[in-house]
């Protein structure tokens, strides 16, 4: 069904970061404008992105309510500057989108060294525990908040001096690494959500090296 | 449902080479860390090295660094173990396994390499 | 690079002995110890990860502990299909190192 002059949305696609959330779509509208519509599997559909022409979405306000929750997205198309009109059905043209469930699926951003410090033949590495737009009473929640102990690291690490690589796992945001005392060393973290399936990992943090100004040093 | 099938494994002479496949069915390998790990015959279990297939990032234990190279195809979803100046002492069944980052939860059947001349 | 003690290597027990299998790092591992049985021609399978949790469809029976350098895996009531040969595996950092093994034998 449908009016001559629109076309559905298609392609519709869940960018999520962090939390950070937006749907994008197609095609680009020629003569039409979209409204987005988001809501839980038992909840009311909430409008958004009124008769824009763009063809995205910013959806986080309405999943960091409950980033647990499954949501379900459409996209209505309206003939431009007739948003009244409707398909032949006495509904507007739309397309829903996959099922997204933010907890389960959005990506983990690009993590960061916070610092590290070296205390004679052992380094502590610091990941920073990035804030995200998840709330909770009123405050911002990091990360580690929103998952806990689902939440890992993967550290990489080698000798400024040597290609050979060792790596470590932590359930926290820190790390206790042996070092050889004198020695040089360049970091790499990854984040990882061990019981996913998909968007397990995130990528590499950028890679940060001892003698370089993050860190501090003692003997 | 997720298998893991390993292949290449044969009799080779010492000082040649030898390129082991996992091939990985029921999840794409890029979303995990993957492994390989030997036992020579009526011994232990030993770690060789890692691979996240995602980023080609690469660790072994020091003893086989140099020596075996572990890559992936992600297009085909195979995970690769490249071993040369194979020696005897390198007989033994190969295996690959996937790694959720808190156990190995998937290994292949394994597969024998013997080098012997 | 840690190594895995394990011990011992080999132990024999009637049906419904409660069998105790320990493995000591050469330091902190931060419970990143599993158990896995193996048996004759098959690839390992996971029983115990973390140290203390059961993996899925694993029998109750099978139990661990332990935290630091010192790990404990129990099985409560020996059965007859759990002849076969455990490891336990560190895999806080790399290199990762598999204990040498416990072959395990019914009288």
């Known amino acids: 069904s449908g009016t001559t002059n629109t076309v559905a949305a298609y392609n519709l696609t869940w960018k999520s970061t962090n939390f950070k959330t937006i749907l994008e779509w197609e095609p680009k509208p020629v003569n039409q404008v979209y409204t987005v519509q988001i809501s839980t599997k038992s909840g009311d559909w909430k409008s958004k992105c009124f008769y824009t022409t763009d063809t995205e979405c910013d959806l986080t306000d309405e999943i960091v309510k409950d980033v647990k929750q499954t949501y379900l997205a459409r996209v209505f198309s309206y003939p431009a500057g007739n948003v009244e009109s409707t398909g032949s059905a006495g509904e507007p043209l739309y397309e829903n989108s996959p099922e997204f469930t933010p907890y389960l699926e959005t990506n983990l951003g690009q993590p960061t060294i916070q610092s590290f410090e070296q205390v004679g033949t052992k380094v502590n590495v610091t990941v920073e525990d990035e804030r995200t737009l998840v709330r909770k009473n009123g405050t911002f929640l990091t990360l580690r908040q929103v998952f806990g102990n689902d939440l890992g690291y993967i550290l990489t690490y080698r000798k400024s001096s040597s290609s050979g690589k060792k790596t470590a796992k932590t359930n926290t945001n820190e790390f206790l690494i042996d070092v050889d005392k004198g020695e040089n060393y360049c970091f790499s973290v990854q984040a990882v959500i061990p019981s996913r399936t998909v968007n397990r990992k995130s990528t590499d943090s950028p890679v940060e090296c001892m003698g370089q100004e993050k860190g501090e040093f003692r003997e | 449902q997720v298998q893991l099938v390993e292949s290449g494994g044969g009799v080779v002479q010492p000082g040649r080479s030898l390129r082991l496949s996992c091939k990985a069915s029921g999840f794409n390998i890029k979303d995990y860390y993957m492994h390989w790990v030997r036992q020579a015959p009526g011994k232990g279990l030993e770690w060789i090295g890692l691979i996240d297939p995602e980023n080609g990032n690469t660790i072994y234990d020091p003893k086989f660094q140099g020596r075996f190279t572990i890559s992936a195809d992600n297009s085909k979803n195979t995970l690769f173990l490249q071993m040369d100046s194979l020696r005897p002492e390198d007989t033994a069944v190969y295996y690959c396994?996937?790694?959720?980052?808190?156990?190995?939860?998937?290994w292949g059947q394994g597969t024998p390499v013997t080098v012997s001349s | 690079d840690i190594q895995m003690t394990q011990s011992p290597s080999s132990l024999s027990a009637s049906v419904g002995d409660r069998v105790t299998i320990t493995c000591k790092a050469s330091q902190d591992i931060r419970k990143y110890l599993n158990w896995y049985q193996q048996k004759p021609g098959k690839a390992p399978k996971l029983l115990i990860y973390?140290?203390?949790s059961l993996a899925d469809g694993v029998p109750s029976r099978f139990s661990g502990s332990g935290s630091g350098t010192d790990y404990t895996f129990t099985i409560s009531s020996l059965q007859p299909e759990d002849i076969a040969t455990y490891y336990c595996l560190q895999h806080g950092e790399s290199p990762y190192t598999f204990g040498q093994g416990t072959k395990l034998e019914i009288t």
């Open positions: 973390y140290a203390t």
């Open positions: 396994a996937r790694d959720n980052s808190y156990y190995f939860d998937y």
